[in-house]
């Protein structure tokens, strides 16, 4: 294409082509003619003396690219009750629907919208939600690794680390947390809370004496509510 700006329509010089992004070659007129911008369509094609005539898309119709379409495209139908509209239908873009929370897209359109949503699978006790999803977007369940558990049936809960017992009553397994025994009453000299670092992905929590209900997000282990009373000695 010549370096200088050329107004359409024009006859391309030998060896040159029309600018692909915003022009097209009209075989009948044998001219480079203007495409219509997003949000418009071709009302009249060009000829040797006059350029393309474009018009705005009507309601519920769109064109997303520079085009030479005779009609605008119809926007996808309204989102279903189990979907949310994440992009509205405008003259320049199609409507995009996504699945509501707790569902995944079982059937996608070529434009990235969702045609059919399905309820997410639930992982039962002993299984947690994996960090990665299945290719179709559904939840993947993985067996809780040693030292972790899940006691719920959920599409969001991951395996959580077992409560760490200074003194054990019942060990945890894949579907239940550990149960701690009461701490020795003789450990009551100078009280201090003993903080311990938990295995990934937990954060530092006080080591507990009695198991308490989990007050923490599911990625964290609940270590109960009562800290050990430790004699104030070096270490820990």
């Amino acid at each position: 294409v010549p370096a200088q700006v050329v107004l359409t329509p024009y006859k391309p010089e030998p060896g040159y082509e029309c600018q692909i992004s915003q022009e097209y070659y009209d075989r009948k007129a044998q001219m480079c003619c203007a495409k219509c911008p997003p949000g418009q369509y071709v009302k009249h094609f060009c000829n040797k003396t006059s350029d393309t005539v474009c018009a705005d898309c009507e309601a519920s119709m769109y064109t997303q690219v520079w085009n030479q379409f005779r009609t605008c495209l119809s926007c996808s139908s309204s989102c279903t009750t189990d979907q949310v509209e994440i992009r509205a239908c405008t003259k320049q873009q199609n409507r995009v629907c996504a699945c509501e929370a707790g569902r995944y897209c079982a059937l996608k359109t070529h434009s990235g919208s969702c045609r059919q949503c399905m309820r997410l699978s639930k992982c039962g006790p002993g299984f947690g939600v994996a960090s990665s999803r299945a290719p179709n977007g559904n939840v993947l369940c993985k067996a809780c690794a040693p030292g972790t558990f899940s006691d719920t049936t959920s599409s969001t809960d991951v395996c959580r680390p077992h409560r760490i017992c200074s003194i054990l009553a019942i060990p945890g397994n894949a579907s239940t947390d550990a149960v701690c025994a009461p701490e020795s009453p003789t450990l009551s000299a100078i009280p201090r809370t003993l903080y311990v670092s938990q295995p990934e992905p937990t954060r530092s929590q006080p080591l507990d004496q009695e198991p308490g209900p989990s007050q923490t997000p599911s990625i964290l282990t609940s270590l109960g509510s009562t800290p050990i009373i430790e004699q104030s000695t070096k270490g820990g």
Partner: antibody, heavy 112, light 110 residues
Framework: QSVEESGGRLVAPGTPLTLTCTVS????????MAWVRQAPGKGLEYIGY?????STYYATWAKGRFTISRTSTTVHLKIASPTTEDTATYFC?????????WGPGTLVTVSS | DVVMTQTPASVEAAVGGTVTIKCQAS??????LSWYQQKPGQPPKLLIY???TLESGVPSRFKGSGSGTEFTLTISDLECADAATYYC????????????FGGGTEVVVK
């Protein structure tokens, strides 16, 4: 609190033997308890433990050879069919990150 | 089961000196490691639990460190009373408790 093991004696190979662990000063029913043994001049060897729900957990080598049971006040270790290799001092201890309760042990000698 | 490998089997040091004992787990046990001291004719005595937490009444000359698979017990300012056999023990919650001990290290104080 104190732990005391008892029941250790000289037995002939193949003669079943049951050891007893008695704990004072704590509510034993709320503690998981383990058995550990030590052959003369050798190191400590973990056998297994029983939790408060009476579920038992054994080291791989100990499965089938030992049975751990409990009452509200005692914990027991049964050696099903002792061999000379089971000659050792047997200790009872609490289970957890902090295993601090240890008795003096009871000596089992297996000999013909 | 987890296998605990303890080195050295025996170590000799002078009064006032320092001794280092190493313990290696066959798989990661996070920080669930205890150290015990045992003297002839006595039961094991808990020194350190949770890899570095000193048990009540144990002198601060005893120091535990490490996590994962590599652990160390350091005894500084050695005293004659420290002559004993030291054991590491795994306390990892892998579904059920695993209680494997290391082979032991005899500490001789000159």
């Amino acid at each position: 609190q104190s732990v005391e093991e008892s029941g250790g004696r000289l037995v002939a190979p193949g003669t079943p033997l049951t050891l007893t662990c008695t704990v004072s000063g704590i509510d034993l029913s709320r503690y998981a308890m383990a058995w550990v043994r030590q052959a003369p001049g050798k190191g400590l060897e973990y056998i297994g433990y029983i939790d408060t729900g009476d579920s038992t957990y054994y080291a791989t080598w100990a499965k089938g050879r030992f049975t751990i049971s409990r009452t509200s006040t005692t914990v027991h270790l049964k050696i099903a069919s002792p061999t000379t290799e089971d000659t050792a001092t047997y200790f009872c201890t609490n289970v957890g990150v902090r295993m601090y309760l240890w008795g003096p042990g009871t000596l089992v000698t297996v000999s013909s | 089961d987890v296998v605990m490998t303890q080195t050295p089997a025996s170590v000799e040091a002078a009064v006032g000196g320092t001794v280092t004992i190493k313990c290696q787990a066959s798989q990661s046990i996070s920080s669930y490691l205890s150290w015990y001291q045992q003297k002839p004719g006595q039961p094991p005595k808990l020194l350190i639990y949770r890899a570095s937490t000193l048990e009540s009444g144990v002198p601060s000359r005893f120091k535990g460190s490490g996590s994962g698979t590599e652990f160390t017990l350091t005894i500084s300012d050695l005293e004659c009373a420290d002559a004993a056999t030291y054991y590491c023990q795994c306390g990892y919650y892998g579904g059920s408790y695993i209680g494997a001990f290391g082979g032991g290290t005899e500490v001789v104080v000159k």
